[in-house]
Amino acid sequence: EEELQVIQPDKSVLVAAGETATLRCTATSLIPVGPIQWFRGAGPGRELIYNQKEGHFPRVTTVSDLTKRNNMDFSIRIGNITPADAGTYYCVKFRKGSPDDVEFKSGAGTELSVRAKPSAPVVSGPAARATPQHTVSFTCESHGFSPRDITLKWFKNGNELSDFQTNVDPVGESVSYSIHSTAKVVLTREDVHSQVICEVAHVTLQGDPLRGTANLSETIRVPPTLEVTQQPVRAENQVNVTCQVRKFYPQRLQLTWLENGNVSRTETASTVTENKDGTYNWMSWLLVNVSAHRDDVKLTCQVEHDGQPAVSKSHDLKVS
């Protein structure tokens, strides 16, 4: 009778992460008597995946009933595959021995490769706000994909960006990979409604590329422009002076009126109007009693926007 052979018909198997891998193995004879074991890798450091005789292997099921006397099919299924399961799996026949079973013959091995989708890209912007004309950096990260080949693109409002640097790690062979990219974006005054998008494409993605977004409203600070104007006299001895605070973002703003350097009133922007570009306008007025002043009055509108140093605009009120 011919000596038992262990047949692993599949040289290689490709499985998607999360799915079940079937590793096929048959023996050509029932003799010698003894169990089958599955290992990942060869040599002394090999990892036991399944032992027919003993042990608990919750992710492994056998394709056929190994308790049947005439069974020669030793194929297994491994559930919920992850990239970490990649490697070469060997079906090994043992001969019954005392006290221990003795390794008799091994199959040629089946290489299990795993394809895994990239995680949803996460885009993060700078910790502090920046003003128009400044260049800010955005990072995009995605993890856990295999194989290594991946494309990453950056867009601002649908226009592709070119100033970015991308790294895929690790550089050498690995079960899965990560991508990290940093893009530089020049802010403009119109960017309150703008979005920066990181787009990742990979062989495993059946839909469109995965996208991560960042709203520039969380990054930009548009400082206000101030204009102080004197309105016609409203009533006897009263002058209305207005301070127009235009095109600012975000809304957080405090305004202080000074009369000849002395604080007259402080208020916080509340009923603002929003511009089409997402910036805000606000107006504050001060009624000045001219009769209370002998000399000309210097009125100052002082604005502290989003915790930044105050900006101010003055107006000289003539007392005739």
Partner: antibody
Framework: VQLVESGGRLGQPGTSLTLSCTVS????????MGWFRQAPGKGLEYIGI?????SPYYASWVNGRFTISKTSTTMDLKMNSLRSEDTATYFC?????????????WGPGTLVTVSS | DIQMTQSPSSLSASVGDRVTITCRAS??????LAWYQQKPGKAPKLLIY???FLYSGVPSRFSGSGSGTDFTLTISSLQPEDFATYYC???????????FGQGTKVEIK
């Protein structure tokens, strides 16, 4: 799992024609689908794909003359300004479950003949 | 666009012969290569994907190898039902586009 193309016929140069690919046994919202063609006695040529979410992508030679769209159970190929060189068998195919780099299920094809 | 050059364009062989078909890409496509078999009047059938993985139900006499730019389809022992035309197909992960080789017709000697 099955794909069947329909709509192939004799068409006049300069006219339009829409081919359909009807699928059964799986959902079009889960897979990338593709259109290919093969002129008589020639090799296979890629036309374009439509993603599971409905975005079309085309071969560089298409130049806006063909449009791929889909509903829940059919994928369409609209061909405008037909030319004699569009005479071919048109195939639809589904990409494999492991990735978009290969096509594991193909329809039998539908013949389009462009002639005056 | 990537060009795929298949060779030979045709070959004559006998049942039982070992047959090798090669496919060369104009630039690296890593392992994104598939092989199809097509018979006259029929749709292509997938044989090999990702350069070396045998598609379900395909006889084990078919095998694929290669990566980068050079790929091979081997039929270890040609059977009567294997007389057909074979195509390689690449996928480029950057352009996300597909290209076919011009085909290899395997005929009976």
């Amino acid at each position: 799992v099955q794909l069947v193309e329909s709509g192939g016929r004799l068409g006049q140069p300069g006219t339009s024609l829409t081919l359909s690919c009807t699928v059964s046994g799986f959902s079009l919202s889960s897979y990338v689908m593709g259109w290919f063609r093969q002129a008589p006695g020639k090799g296979l040529e890629y036309i374009g794909i439509i993603s599971s979410s409905g975005s079309p992508y085309y071969a560089s030679w298409v130049n806006g003359r063909f449009t791929i769209s889909k509903t829940s159970t059919t994928m369409d190929l609209k061909m405008n300004s037909l030319r004699s060189e569009d005479t071919a068998t048109y195939f639809c195919a589904r990409v494999g479950p492991l990735g978009v780099d290969y096509f594991n299920i193909w329809g039998p094809g539908t013949l389009v003949t462009v002639s005056s | 666009d990537i060009q795929m050059t298949q060779s030979p364009s045709s070959l004559s062989a006998s049942v039982g012969d070992r047959v090798t078909i090669t496919c060369r890409a104009s630039q690296s496509i890593n392992s994104y290569l598939a092989w199809y078999q097509q018979k006259p009047g029929k749709a292509p059938k997938l044989l090999i994907y990702s350069a070396s993985f045998l598609y379900s139900g395909v006889p084990s006499r078919f095998s694929g190898s290669g990566s980068g730019t050079d790929f091979t389809l081997t039929i270890s022992s040609l059977q009567p039902e294997d007389f057909a035309t074979y195509y390689c197909q690449s996928w480029h992960y950057i352009s996300r586009s597909y290209t076919f080789g011009q085909g290899t017709k395997v005929e009976i000697k």
